[in-house]
Amino acid sequence: CKAMHVAQPAVVLASSRGIASFVCEYASPGKATEVRVTVLRQADSQVTEVCAATYMMGNELTFLDDSICTGTSSGNQVNLTIQGLRAMDTGLYICKVELMYPPPYYLGIGNGTQIYVIDPEPCPDSDF
């Protein structure tokens, strides 16, 4: 297993609709054709695999399970979007990138993006 640098923004604020997007960029040492991207959440004394996708370079990301994540890839960048977030989902979201094929296997883990989620205030009742 060889190490690889992964960069991601330090902080992202989710939209009022609970959507957060960030770019995960990896310094590919070679020409990988198969890449696996996993988003981990570290918070509340837990580590959770939020979503994971494997893709062939130039193709769409295919996420596992009924994922709350979507994404696109462009070169060595992966644009990730996490939907349906609520205030309690605030936490550090870490991008993990694995170059699966061809060998050698490379692994890179980013420092994490702190995603802040603020639940929208309910609209006050109106007489009009």
């Epitope: 959440r41 918070a43 509340d44 837990q46 959770t48 695999e49 939020v50 979503c51 994971a52 596992l64 399970d65 009924d66 994922s67 709350i68 996490i82 349906g84 977030l85 309690m88 989902d89 936490g91 979201y93």
Partner: nanobody, 125 residues
């Protein structure tokens, strides 16, 4: 409806390994998030690990990360908790639970609809 039955608990020495099993009944097992929780007498139930419906995604409490591994076999309707490098503080009753909700960034807080009766794990020093 899902019925859950845990097994595999027992008395072990610190540093030993143990594998807990959870047998589920019900045709829709593969659509449930499965979790393991533990509870000591007089204490609150504590999240240990969870696994997504397909088994592709997992979640662990920091206290067990790297020592415990959760897995599932949807064909056999089984969930497992492989526990290694056990410590005396792992002593608890371990419960298997099922939640019919989408995977989320915090499966520990999901609403678990079904629970097993628990299996005792005792780790002596």
């Amino acid at each position: 409806e899902v019925q859950l039955v845990e097994s595999g608990g027992g008395l072990v020495q610190a540093g030993d390994s143990l594998r807990l099993s959870c047998a589920a009944s019900g045709r829709t097992f593969s659509s449930y998030i499965m979790g393991w929780f533990r509870q000591a007498p007089g204490k609150e139930r504590e999240f240990v690990a969870a696994i997504s419906s397909s088994g592709a995604l997992t979640s662990y409490a920091d206290s067990v990360k790297g020592r415990f591994t959760i897995s599932r076999d949807n064909a056999e309707k089984m969930v497992y908790l492989q526990m290694s490098s056990l410590k005396p503080e792992d002593t608890d009753v371990y419960y298997c639970a099922a939640a019919r909700v989408p995977w989320s960034p915090r499966p520990s807080l999901s609403t678990y609809d079904y629970w097993g009766q628990g299996t005792q794990v005792t780790v002596s020093s």
